[in-house]
């Protein structure tokens, strides 16, 4: 049979490299010889290039090389396909140069902060040493900052006449290292060079960007006074290498400014003894470039009553995140805080917040959260200047098995019953909310039966059991991700009551 | 800038063979063809033929094909070509001239400084 | 192989004339002609290409035209630095041939 017809036929000038196309043979049964019948210079020349490979995936290509190919040329090219049986002809097709050209990538060499121009970065290029010197360039620009991962193009095009290989990255983040790299195309090509190597720059440092303040408020002390513990962190989207020096903090009682009080520190906290009045606390921060806006918060009174909206709160784990969701009354309640830190006997130390606008759950990621770590979540709802009542749950980033099951205890043995308790597992072992317990129980050579209690119940009353009888039991702590047995108990059924 | 710094005067006996070295800087070498053109005492100009560097494709003259060999190698940016069987009217300059124009191919944009090869007995 | 005639071998002329080389292939060759200037002792310099186009730092006193068989190098105002031996190459496809050249002399 004749050869299959070469289709999809695609060329594409590697500049002062060669011109390759390529085509999709078809399905092949013998052994087929390809010849490219190529004009040139205008129609003015042509040539053959013919396959001489013996795999059929190289034979669905070939190329010409310099110096019988110039730029700016219009081309005509069609594959002929031969084998034993005969000769047979693709399409003609017409090619551009100049809009199939592709260079090598320009090397990016500099890439620097404009001494007093702020959010921006200079990049400084060489040309492709390979580029149509009749042609301008277009370029692409991508960047990201160092700890991101997806990138931001910018397109621009310089003239052939240009010296000038240099671009103005504007509207960046300050004092903020960026990843770099720059690809090129003549003008009128479809076909964009490779991406050149990745080149690192900074933008210039500016004052801090501001400040997130929140408080925890603790109980009243003998003598009136409050102690409250003022945190504080950058704001959100402040360059992650913006320098600090210090703060500073003001506070004064609501009722009268003239009661001023300052401090510096150099910490991120800050406890502070207030009278049980209301009170507005402010702060800054400097470092050698200026001070950051103020921030704010307001303290209430000790007696002061705070509005409570939230209804209902559930946490759940999907996708690699912990997702907490909440339903509230308040309508025009829409910026709220949140509070998490691991729920250990001991006084929390690392207590983490974050503020969420403009919806009703939060996400976390969860290797930021220890995995089988109890932690207690709470919801602050926040409106202008008053913090409302927190509403607070456990939750589990990532469920285990409990380290251990349940200590357990067999009480008032009967003839045929006896109660089977056992206690909490402890926080630091539980590894998961536990969901339920399970008893097993075994008579000496019989059948084993099991009975499943919710996780409020510690205790449980076996009945029908058979009179001096020897039996085992065990009792089974749950989690989302399995249960762990507690140690075996060995029991034995009395022979006669005292009631019988 | 792109230049082409040729070997020095070589004197040879008829039947033996010379070897021209042309070293290019400032332009990448695998971009352009290396022609070789010599230049008889008085006389005109005659091509001998061409190298692409980038895949050592060759093209020579009908009139010296027996006896001319241009080789390049990428490593050194560095184009030669040998003429065996050497006779004195092989006597001439030898240039190296650089492949010139996108839109003008085969024309030869920059010259080596030429290398007179003397043939006598 | 494609042969290139170049006439006259010699001319003499004096600083400011306009001056006239013609060159004539022995087959159509579009226009794919190239000239070069050549003074004693040095290589060749190219001044035209495509029949017409200029080199880079080409003076705009050298010009070229024709096409097909026929071609012409004009100097517009001969300058003293303009006194050299000039020659025509067909840069059609290999093998590439030269003009037996024109030598330009001062009056």
């Known amino acids: 049979a004749l050869p299959a017809k070469p289709e999809n036929i695609s060329c594409v000038y590697y500049y002062r490299k060669n011109l390759t196309c390529t085509w999709s043979p078809g399905k092949e049964t013998s052994y087929t010889q390809y010849t490219v019948k190529r004009t040139y210079a205008f129609g003015e020349k042509h040539d053959n290039c013919t396959t001489n490979s013996s795999t059929s995936e190289n034979r669905a290509s070939c190329s010409f090389f310099l110096p019988r190919i110039t730029i700016p040329d219009n081309y005509t090219i069609e594959v002929e396909a031969e084998n034993g049986d005969g000769v047979i002809k693709s399409h003609m097709t017409y090619w551009r140069l100049e809009n199939i050209a592709k260079t090598e990538p320009p090397k990016i060499f500099r890439v620097k902060p404009v001494l007093g121009i702020k959010r921006m970065i200079q990049i400084e290029w060489i040309k492709p040493e390979l580029a149509p010197v009749s042609s301008d360039l277009k370029y692409t620009l991508r960047f990201r900052t160092v700890n991101s991962t997806s990138w931001m193009e910018v397109n621009f095009a310089k003239n052939r006449k240009d010296k000038n290989q240099t671009y103005n990255l504007t509207g960046l983040q300050p004092f903020t290292e960026y990843v770099i790299a720059l690809r090129c195309a003549v003008k009128e090509s479809k076909f964009w060079s490779d991406w050149s190597q990745e080149k690192m720059g900074m933008t210039e440092e500016e004052a801090p960007c501001g400040l997130e303040l929140w408080r925890v408020l603790k109980p009243a002390e003998a003598d009136g006074r409050r102690p409250v513990r003022l945190l504080w962190k950058k704001a959100r989207g402040a360059p992650v290498l913006e320098k600090t020096l210090g703060y500073n903090i003001w506070y004064y009682p609501e009722s009268n400014t003239n009661l001023t009080e300052t401090m510096n520190t150099t910490n991120q906290q800050l406890e502070l003894h207030l009278g049980g009045e209301s009170f507005w606390v402010s702060m800054i921060s400097y470092n050698s470039l200026g001070k950051s806006p103020v921030a704010t918060l307001r303290i209430p009174a000790i007696q002061e009553k705070s509005f409570q909206c939230i209804e209902v709160m559930q946490a759940c784990v999907a996708e690699d995140q912990l997702v907490v969701k909440w339903q509230s009354s308040a309508l025009d309640v829409n910026t709220w805080m949140i509070e998490w830190f691991p729920d250990v006997d001991s006084e929390p130390t690392t207590l983490s917040w974050e503020s969420v606008s403009q919806a009703t759950n939060w996400t976390i990621q969860q290797d930021k959260l220890k995995p089988f770590w109890c932690y207690n979540i709470s919801v602050y709802p926040m409106l202008h200047d008053k913090v409302g009542e927190p509403y607070s749950i456990q939750a589990y980033a990532k469920e285990g098995v409990p380290s251990e099951g349940p200590e357990t205890k067999v009480e008032n043995i009967g003839v045929k019953t006896v109660t089977i308790t056992w206690k909490e597992i402890p926080k630091s072992e539980r590894k998961g909310i536990i969901c339920n317990y399970t008893i097993f129980y075994q008579a000496e050579g019989g059948k084993g039966f099991s009975k499943t209690v919710n996780s409020s119940i510690l205790q449980y009353g076996l009945e029908s059991l058979k009179r001096k009888t020897s039996y085992i039991v065990q009792v089974m702590a749950s989690t989302s991700a399995g249960g762990t047995n507690g140690t075996s108990i060995n029991f034995k059924t009395l022979s006669f009551s005292v009631f019988e | 800038q792109v230049q082409l710094v040729q070997s020095g005067a070589e004197v040879k006996k008829p039947g033996a063979s010379v070897k021209v070295s042309c070293k290019a800087s400032?332009?990448?070498?695998?971009?352009?063809?290396m022609n070789w053109v010599r230049q008889a005492p008085g006389q005109g100009l005659e091509w001998m033929g061409l190298i692409n560097p980038y895949n050592g494709g060759t093209d020579y003259n009908p009139q010296f094909q027996d006896r001319v060999t241009i080789t390049a190698d990428e490593s050194t940016s560095t184009a030669y070509m040998e003429l065996s069987s050497l006779r004195s009217e092989d006597t001439a300059v030898y240039y190296c001239?650089?492949?010139?124009?996108?839109?003008?191919?085969?024309?030869?944009?920059?010259w080596g400084q030429g290398t007179l090869v003397t043939v006598s007995s | 192989d494609i042969q290139m005639t170049q006439s006259p071998s010699s001319l003499s002329a004096s600083v400011g004339d306009r001056v006239t080389i013609t060159c004539q292939a022995s087959?159509?060759?579009?226009?794919?002609v190239a000239w070069y200037q050549q003074k004693p002792g040095k290589a060749p310099k190219l001044l035209i290409y495509?029949?017409?186009t200029e080199a880079q730092g080409v003076p705009s006193r050298f010009s070229g035209s024709g096409s097909g068989t026929d071609f012409t190098l004009t100097i517009s105002s001969l300058q003293p630095e303009d006194f050299a031996t000039y020659y025509c190459?067909?840069?059609?496809?290999?093998?590439?041939?030269f003009g037996g050249g024109t030598k330009v002399e001062i009056k």
């Open positions: 087959e159509d060759i579009y226009s794919f």
């Open positions: 495509n029949a017409q």
């Open positions: 190459q067909h840069h059609y496809d290999s093998p590439l041939t």
């Open positions: 001239a650089r492949d010139g124009y996108d839109d003008g191919p085969y024309t030869l944009e920059t």
């Open positions: 400032g332009y990448t070498f695998t971009g352009y063809a």
